[in-house]
Interface confidence: low
């Protein structure tokens, strides 16, 4: 099924409009902003949340402008282009005719330009690394645990195949969280990394996108794991393309 | 050729404000993040603060942020630092640097000459 | 703040011999460090870039090696011209931040 029978509602996407108007009445949702039909089984695509997150009105968004913590993704938020499948479109435009290319995940990868600036291809997002601080504790977590926590979340909150969490890396009070997923490891129905670290990001913000489920409460061995920031940087297949002699 | 030029330096009397411009040629500063750092005499550099000229967005260091203002003027491809309640201990070469986007890049790959500011009565 | 503290303040190095200058950095920055040197009047130079990346057109005898919190700047052999101050900076996050530099003399 692609959404919960009895209330209509998606699991996996709240920044969705669903009615009993699919085949046989079955319930079907639609997401905010671009009324594209989505997979309720599994998570929504990223550039679809953006998409949504930006035609919410302004007092019912409860994500503002990242801080500028948000270290890579520092353009902050913008109202994309998504393509049939829901994916990025490799170039973005604002509405006033600047324009940049983006990688698989939405993060701008080459200068801003004009309308003339051409961006070939989708380049894929490969490698995530999710950097966490949390809150002082009593005693360091056990690694161990730590890790084995952070893959069934990843797995059973987000779907994402164990084999794509590549490391746990843990230094008191740092913790890496090491996706990858290179284009041919990503089988049909795999949930795309970029969009389980954008899920997690979420969460951890206690901006939750899952359908009436409580927020994410992240213990090891009963100890709750409270993260005080998040910092995310992607590595593409193609090394962005800014226009610094390095990179020439 | 890649090249950022400061301007404004000079002696400043205490309590007054300083103005400093930076322009650039053989890059469009719309592209970059322009900064601003600093290095007192005989000292190590201080990083100041940063503006993204395409939309404005600044990043002050905490330790000015209630007297520096960072503003663009992309139709001359520059960005001007303004400083206000100058202090002796605020006597230094302030440099202009530009970085990328994204973290990854936000190293100094091209620097000013450099402009010396003396304040003192 | 991320602190950045290097060792040692001042290297006296024979020409022809190598030099290690270290970093540390106060918390985690992953490979987000750079290294800059500054000759005396003149402008910092970028030499070195995520850690280990060699900036165009730096000598190969300069390399960068490190991740987390401990960073080293090697010059495998010193050269007269290398006379400089060295400095690390971290580009992980804002505010950014330098050390506090190291004199690299010749012995």
């Known amino acids: 099924h692609t959404a919960a029978q009895d209330n209509c509602t998606c699991p996996t996407n709240k920044m969705t409009v669903c009615s009993p108007d699919g085949p046989g009445g079955r319930c079907q949702c639609r997401a905010l902003g671009s009324g594209m039909a989505v997979d309720c089984s599994t998570l929504t695509s990223k550039c679809l949340l953006l998409k949504a997150r930006m035609s919410a009105p302004k007092n019912a968004r409860t994500l503002v402008r990242p801080s500028e913590h948000a270290l890579v993704d520092n353009d902050g938020l913008y109202d994309p282009d998504c393509d049939p499948e829901g994916r990025f479109k490799a170039r973005q435009c604002n509405q006033t005719s600047v324009c940049w290319c983006v990688n698989s995940v939405g993060v701008r990868r080459t200068d801003k330009g004009d309308l003339s600036l051409r961006c070939d291809e989708l380049v894929r997002t490969h490698h995530i690394l999710i950097d966490l601080r949390h809150r002082p504790t009593a005693g360091a977590f056990n690694h161990s645990d730590l890790d084995a926590e952070l893959r069934r979340l990843f797995r059973e909150r987000y779907r994402l195949h164990p084999k794509f969490v590549a490391a746990v890396h843990y230094e008191q009070p740092t913790i890496q969280i090491e996706l990858r997923q290179n284009t041919s490891q990503k089988a049909a129905g795999d949930v795309d990394i970029g969009d389980a670290a954008y899920y997690f990001e979420r969460d951890i913000k206690g901006e939750s996108l899952f359908q009436g489920r409580g927020g994410l409460d992240l213990r090891v061995r009963g100890e709750p794991l409270q993260v005080e920031r998040t910092l995310i940087y992607y590595l593409d297949e193609i090394p962005p393309k800014f226009s610094m002699k390095r990179l020439t | 050729e890649v090249q950022l030029v400061e301007s404004g330096g000079g002696l400043i009397q205490p309590g007054g404000s300083l103005r400093l411009s930076c322009a650039a040629s053989?890059?469009?500063?719309?592209?970059?993040?322009m900064n601003w750092v600093r290095q007192a005499p005989g000292q190590g550099l201080e990083w100041m603060g940063r503006?993204?000229?395409?939309?404005?967005?600044?990043h002050y260091n905490q330790k000015f942020k209630d007297r520096l203002t960072i503003t663009k003027d992309t139709s001359k491809n520059q960005v001007v630092l303004t400083m206000t309640n100058m202090d002796p201990v605020d006597t230094a070469t302030y440099y202009c640097?530009?970085?990328?986007?994204?973290?990854?890049?936000?190293?100094?790959?091209?620097w000013g000459q450099g402009t010396t500011v003396t304040v003192s009565s | 703040d991320i602190v950045m503290t290097q060792t040692p303040l001042s290297l006296p190095v024979t020409p022809g011999e190598p030099a290690s200058i270290s970093c540390k950095a106060s918390?985690?920055?992953?490979?987000?460090v750079a290294w800059y040197l500054q000759k005396p009047g003149q402008s910092p130079q970028l030499l070195i870039y995520s850690a280990s990346y060699r900036y165009t057109g730096v000598p190969d005898r300069f390399s960068g090696s490190g991740s987390g919190t401990d960073f080293t700047l090697t010059i495998s052999s010193l050269q007269a011209e290398d006379v400089a101050v060295y400095y690390c900076q971290q580009h992980y996050s804002t505010p950014l931040t330098f050390g506090q530099g190291t004199r690299l003399e010749i012995k």
């Open positions: 053989g890059f469009t500063v719309s592209n970059y993040w």
């Open positions: 918390q985690d920055v992953s490979t987000a």
């Open positions: 640097a530009r970085s990328g986007f994204g973290s990854t890049y936000w190293f100094f790959d091209v």
């Open positions: 503006i993204d000229p395409n939309d404005s967005e600044t």
